[in-house]
Amino acid sequence: SGTTNTVAAYNLTWKSTNFKTILEWEPKPVNQVYTVQISTKSGDWKSKCFYTTDTECDLTDEIVKDVKQTYLARVFSYPAGNVESTGSAGEPLYENSPEFTPYLETNLGQPTIQSFEQVGTKVNVTVEDERTLVRRNNTFLSLRDVFGKDLIYTLYYWKSSSSGKKTAKTNTNEFLIDVDKGENYCFSVQAVIPSRTVNRKSTDSPVECMGQEKGEFRE
C-alpha cells in the first residue's frame, strides 16, 4: 500500500566509525523525497534531513548525546511535489532501521602511531588518542575518554630484516617493548574492545618503521 509512485525505503544501514554516524538506505529517489526520524527506546522522535533527495542522513549530533543509549531510526517517503500526502493508512510510508547502540557498535577507526622513541634496548610506542565528536562540558572527548579501560591496543612489531611478528597489548595508549640493540623494527597497531560481540577490532594502522620520521633514538 502507499501513495502513487512512492516506495518505502529499504536496506536501512547504520555506518558508524568513532561515533561519526550516518544512516544509509535505498532506493535512489525518483519523484520522491525522504525525512528521517531518530529516537531512543524511551524518547520522542526527532526529525532530521527534512525532505531530502539524499539516501543518507548524518545522525551524529543525536547519538553523541548519549552513546550508551539504543537508537532506532525510521525513514519516511513522500511524493516530491506533495509532501503532505499520506499513504492509504493515513500516514506517510516509512521503514524502521535496525536498533543501534553506538558504544557497542560504532566501528573503531584505523589508529595512528603518533611516535616511537628508543632508549637503549627499549622502545616506547605511542598511539594517537583520536578525538571523537562526543562532547561533555563543551569539550570533545577522545576515544580513550569515552571507552576508558574497555579499549585496548595491540601492537604488532617485527625486525625490518625478518617477517616474524611479536605482539604486545596495553589498556593505555603506550607500549614499552624490549628490542635487540642495533636492529630496526617496524610497528603497526590495532584498536580492540575485547568485551564487544561485534566490531571488536579496528583495521591495522599504517606501518611505521625505525629509521623514519616519527622515531627518535637515544643511547
Epitope: 552513546v67 550508551k68 543509549q69 588518542d129 580513550r144 576508558g148 574497555d150
Partner: antibody, heavy 120, light 111 residues
Framework: KQSVEESEGGLFKPTDTLTLTCTVS????????VSWVRQAPGNGLEWIGT???????YYASWANGRFTISNDNAPNTVSLQVNSLAAADTATYFC??????????????WGPGTLVTVSS | ELDLTQTASPVSAAVGGTVTINCQAS????????LSWYQQKPGQPPKLLIY???TLASGVPSRFSGSGFGTEFTLTISDVQCDDAATYYC???????????FGGGTKVVVE
C-alpha cells in the same frame, strides 16, 4: 539541574550494617559512573569505590569485601553497604559523579555528604 | 600500594601572588594524564577544578591551571584571591582496573 545527594547517615553501633543511598537527578547512570568517597573528621579524602556506567564495580584494596556498591534498587540510585562497622568507619560519606563514566577519578558533581558516626 | 604525595601543608600565598602545589605518583597514572585536582573548603564537599591533568572544569576561573604527565603533576593558582584559601587534593586513576587514589591534601593559607 544535575545533582547527587546522599541519604541520611546517623549514629551506628560497632558490627552494625550501614546502607547509604545516592540519588541522582538530571543525568543517566547508564552514561555516568558514581563513586563513593569518605572523609574522617579532620582527615583527607579516601576513595572507597566506583560503579561505572556499565554497572561494573571497583573498590579500594582496603574496602574490598566489607563494602558493596550497587544500583539494583532503582534507576536513579546507587547504594553503598558497609558490613561490620567499626569506629574507624566514622566519617562523612560523599557520593560523586564520574565525569567520564568509568573509574577515571574525575568527579565533577558531589553530594553535600552525610555524617556516619560509629560508637558503642 | 598506590600513593600520591602532595606538597606539605600549609602553603602560604599572598593575595595577587602565585602558588604551586605538586603531586607525585608512585607509578604512572592511567594513560599518563588521568589526574584531577579538587578544592575543598571546611564543611563543604570537594569541587573539581582540573581533570585529565590540564583541562579546566566547567565554571572554574582560568587562574587555576594544571600541568604534568606520567608521575609528576602541578596545580598552579595565579593572581591568588582570599577565596582560594582551602585544601587542595589531587586524585588519579591507574592502569590497574581497580585503583583510584587521592593525595593527602595541601592546605593553602592566603595572607
Amino acid at each position: 539541574k544535575q545533582s547527587v545527594e546522599e541519604s541520611e547517615g546517623g549514629l551506628f553501633k560497632p558490627t552494625d550494617t550501614l546502607t547509604l543511598t545516592c540519588t541522582v537527578s538530571g543525568f543517566s547512570l547508564s552514561y555516568y559512573g558514581v563513586s563513593w568517597v569518605r572523609q574522617a573528621p579532620g582527615n583527607g579524602l579516601e576513595w572507597i569505590g566506583t560503579i561505572d556506567s556499565s554497572g561494573r564495580t571497583y573498590y579500594a584494596s582496603w574496602a574490598n569485601g566489607r563494602f558493596t556498591i550497587s544500583n539494583d534498587n532503582a534507576p536513579n540510585t546507587v547504594s553503598l553497604q558497609v558490613n561490620s562497622l567499626a569506629a574507624a568507619d566514622t566519617a562523612t560519606y560523599f557520593c560523586a559523579r564520574d565525569f567520564y563514566g568509568w573509574n577515571s577519578g574525575a568527579l565533577d558533581i558531589w553530594g553535600p555528604g552525610t555524617l556516619v558516626t560509629v560508637s558503642s | 600500594e598506590l600513593d600520591l604525595t602532595q606538597t606539605a601543608s600549609p602553603v602560604s600565598a599572598a593575595v595577587g601572588g602565585t602558588v604551586t602545589i605538586n603531586c607525585q605518583a608512585s607509578q604512572s597514572v592511567y594513560s599518563n594524564k588521568y589526574l584531577s585536582w579538587y578544592q575543598q573548603k571546611p564543611g563543604q564537599p570537594p569541587k573539581l577544578l582540573i581533570y585529565k591533568a590540564s583541562t579546566l572544569a566547567s565554571g572554574v576561573p582560568s587562574r587555576f591551571s594544571g600541568s604534568g604527565f606520567g608521575t609528576e603533576f602541578t596545580l598552579t593558582i595565579s593572581d591568588v584571591q582570599c577565596d582560594d584559601a582551602a585544601t587542595y587534593y589531587c586524585a588519579a586513576a591507574y592502569s590497574d582496573d581497580s585503583d583510584t587514589a587521592f593525595g593527602g591534601g595541601t592546605k593553602v593559607v592566603v595572607e
